[in-house]
């Protein structure tokens, strides 16, 4: 009778995370009598995975009928595989001993590799909004994938970006990996409706990459342009002055009218109109009673947009010496200035 050998026919086994791994093992002899044990790793720190003789191994099931006469097959199934299960598994024959069984012979080992899908990429932008022509950074993170090889691309509105840096960690061997990438994007005034997309391709995804998106509407601030104009006289001694607030984003905006530097009225943008590019327009008007003023009036439209320092535009109303006599022909010179 030839001495027993432990045969592990599979040098390696590749399993997708969440599935079941089958590890095969055959003994070439019934002699010596004794149980089979499965270990992950070798040496003193090896981890017991299954012991035919005793123990409770809820994730492990035996494939063959261990009690069948002449049985020399000892495969096991390990359920719900995770990347942490990766490693080399050894089938070890023990010889019946007293009081304890004695290790007799080990198989050559089967390397279990786990394919794990990357998590959905999470894209995050800068903490504070930025204005057009500024460069902002976006980060993309995905975790828990294996093997290490992975491809990451950045897009803005379908156009691939080239200015980015990517790291896969850890550098050495690991049960699973993470990817971190930072892309630089130059903002334009038309970016309110723009999207930045991070796309991750991995062998586990069967050619169907995962995508994470960020809307530039959460990143961009488009400051308004102001225009103050005087409208034709509405009634005797009354002038209607309007402040056009154009092309701003986001909507959060407060407007204050000043007459000769004194606050006349403050209002918050409410009934705005939206432009095709996603920015907003708004108009505010002020009715000025010219007869109440002896001297010229400096009207200022002051706008505080999205918590930023106020911008303003002024308009000078020239008041004549005898405004009552001029009636509806009151003259008013329009001299505007943009004050910030």
């Amino acid at each position: 009778e030839e001495e027993l050998q432990v045969i592990q026919p599979d040098k390696s086994v590749l399993v997708a995370a969440g599935e079941t791994a089958t590890l095969r093992c055959t003994a070439t002899s019934l002699i010596p009598v004794g149980p089979i044990q499965w270990f992950r790793g070798a040496g003193p720190g090896r981890e017991l995975i299954y012991n035919q003789k005793e123990g409770h191994f809820p994730r492990v099931t035996t494939v063959s009928d261990l009690t069948k006469r002449n049985n020399m097959d000892f495969p096991i199934r390990i359920g719900n595989i995770t990347p942490a299960d990766a490693g080399t598994y050894y089938c070890v024959k023990f010889r019946k001993g007293s009081p304890d069984d004695v290790e007799f012979k080990s198989g050559a080992g089967t390397e279990l590799s786990v394919r794990a899908k990357p998590s959905a990429p999470v894209v995050s932008g800068p903490a504070a909004r930025a204005t057009p022509q500024h460069t902002v950074s976006f980060t993309c993170e995905s975790h828990g994938f294996s093997p290490r090889d992975i491809t990451l691309k950045w897009f803005k509105n379908g156009n691939e970006l080239s200015d980015f840096q990517t790291n896969v960690d850890p550098v050495g061997e690991s049960v699973s990996y993470s990817i971190h990438s930072t892309a630089k994007v130059v903002l334009t005034r038309e970016d309110v409706h723009s999207q930045v997309i991070c796309e991750v391709a991995h062998v586990t995804l069967q050619g169907d990459p995962l995508r994470g998106t960020a809307n530039l509407s959460e990143t961009i601030r488009v400051p308004p342009t102001l225009e103050v104009t005087q409208q034709p006289v509405r009634a005797e001694n009354q002038v209607n002055v309007t402040c056009q607030v154009r092309k701003f984003y986001p909507q959060r905006l407060q407007l204050t009218w000043l007459e000769n530097g004194n606050v006349s009225r403050t209002e918050t943008a409410s009934t705005v109109t939206e432009n095709k590019d996603g920015t907003y327009n708004w108009m505010s008007w002020l009715l000025v009673n010219v007869s109440a003023h002896r001297d010229d009036v400096k009207l200022t439209c002051q706008v505080e947009h999205d918590g930023q320092p106020a911008v303003s535009k002024s308009h000078d109303l020239k008041v004549s010496a005898h405004p009552k006599e001029q009636g509806s022909n009151t003259a008013a010179e329009n001299t505007g200035s943009n004050e910030r």
Epitope: L30, V33, K53, L66, T67
Partner: antibody, heavy 119, light 110 residues
Framework: QVQLVQSGAEVKKPGASVKVSCKAS????????INWVRQAPGQGLEWIAM????????HYNQIFKDRATLTTDTSTSTAYMELRSLRSDDTAVYYC????????????WGRGTLVTVSS | DIVLTQSPDSLAVSLGERATINCRAS??????????IFWYQQKPGQPPKLLIY???NRDSGVPDRFSGSGSGTDFTLTISSLQAEDVAVYYC????????FGQGTKLEIK
Amino acid sequence: QVQLVQSGAEVKKPGASVKVSCKASGYTFTNYWINWVRQAPGQGLEWIAMIDPSDSETHYNQIFKDRATLTTDTSTSTAYMELRSLRSDDTAVYYCAMDYGSLYAMDYWGRGTLVTVSS
Amino acid sequence: DIVLTQSPDSLAVSLGERATINCRASQSVRSSGYNWIFWYQQKPGQPPKLLIYLASNRDSGVPDRFSGSGSGTDFTLTISSLQAEDVAVYYCQHSRELPTFGQGTKLEIK
């Protein structure tokens, strides 16, 4: 350490039944066959039957097929052998034994249970 | 059914001497490359103890003065140098089919 602990001695009248228990410890009960063997006073060993606790598959010696029933309770790792229609020549020590190699052999034995059948 | 016949029924051997017990099967017990014969030792008041499995393999903890041999139908248990603690009844058992035992051989010291 494998241990098989058997129930205590029994005295039965002819025609009665006896149920002997064998509680296993130190190993996974469902992975190994349990054999039952008896030995009449001053006589040799006589194999009765065997059971696989994993699925209750049984094999009986033809002599005992109609009178013996083997069962197991996997929740308590206990094997049972019931013998019916007892006769005086059933007086014997009844052993349970575990087959560690699935060779239909008897590697570990209980201490035995003496069953006396007497009117 | 396979019948096992042991010989002799009893045997007296001097301490330090060789003891030989035979077991003959009514038909071959060889199958799948193995001889399905087992030897047990039973001392008074104790359960039997497995000595040899598959004809020639010593069980764990069995002194190497015990050996088994044979093939097919004829098998032998040999104690190379009898010790006082070897006094017992020895049984062969087959498992080529369902198990049966030989009638036993009583070994005593001469």
